[in-house]
Amino acid sequence: QLLEPCGYIYPEFPVVQRGSNFTAICVLKEACLQHYYVNASYIVWKTNHAAVPREQVTVINRTTSSVTFTDVVLPSVQLTCNILSFGQIEQNVYGVTMLSGFPPDKPTNLTCIVNEGKNMLCQWDPGRETYLETNYTLKSEWATEKFPDCQSKHGTSCMVSYMPTYYVNIEVWVEAENALGKVSSESINFDPVDKVKPT
């Protein structure tokens, strides 16, 4: 039998920009209040199993408590909402992982080379470390035709799956996206024949 949690933390998947402030709330279910004879003032917040100081906690109403963190710098924190019930027995209500990092920088210095008769490799500078899962996508178009996207495995280069056509200009750019933002590099326009790597 699956046991329903006693309440929830919102947001459920918190991602915070490093150095900024962050507030989470824990909402207890009515049934939980009655079963354990508690209200939100009984909530104990913990980060990585250590109790959060009381001055960071606010009881909003009988079911809801909030916690505020200033200048978040740790890359990953386990945040839990717990209740003290029946003579100080601590009961876990809900837990989330709070991640912190940066939105992606605009990729710069985009360059491409063509391996004749094979494929095209493009490389770029992703900028500063984001400390978050960040997806880099190489995008390309010719006139009004969109080519397949190239998903980068390493975040600094991508080998396109198509063989570019010579003697027509294509446009190539890089998109970077994580939980904190989405950006695009400026595009470069070139005829692939001009980027052929001498064998």
Partner: nanobody, 124 residues
Framework: QVQLQESGGGLVQPGGSLRLSCAAS?????TYWIYWVRQAPGKGPEW???????????YYADSVNGRFTISRDNAKNTVYLQMNNLKPEDAAVYYC?????????????????TGQGTQVTVSS
């Protein structure tokens, strides 16, 4: 004469919708990235959205993401900005701009609206 003409603005209540159009005359719109920019009274211009030449790539300002949708019909030489769930802070003159390539998103350079634009008013 080569020009872009914006239309479709008007007065709408908060929560309402409008569809703006950007039509090209004198040149083929399909060879350009199109950017929507807005400028509220007493404020600087703000990038709103862009669409690539094929229409396959779109970008939005955080303030409009999820509410606005940019699209293009290259056969009609027109780009559209569908604006839903409008808010009072969306009120501005909206302009479209053309660029031969992707300026990056969000663009670093300051937009310089040149056309007449179309006025969007959001008020109850």
């Amino acid at each position: 004469q080569v020009q872009l003409q914006e239309s479709g603005g008007g007065l709408v209540q908060p929560g309402g919708s409008l569809r703006l159009s950007c039509a090209a005359s004198g040149f083929t719109l399909s060879t350009y990235w199109i950017y929507w920019v807005r400028q509220a009274p007493g404020k600087g211009p703000e990038w709103v959205s862009t669409v690539s030449r094929s229409g396959g790539t779109t970008y939005y300002a955080d303030s409009v993401n999820g509410r606005f949708t940019i699209s293009r019909d290259n056969a009609k030489n027109t780009v559209y900005l569908q604006m839903n769930n409008l808010k009072p802070e969306d009120a501005a003159v909206y302009y479209c701009l053309a660029s031969v390539s992707n300026l990056g998103w969000p663009p670093v350079r300051a937009p310089s609206p040149t056309g007449q634009g179309t006025q969007v008013t959001v008020s109850s």
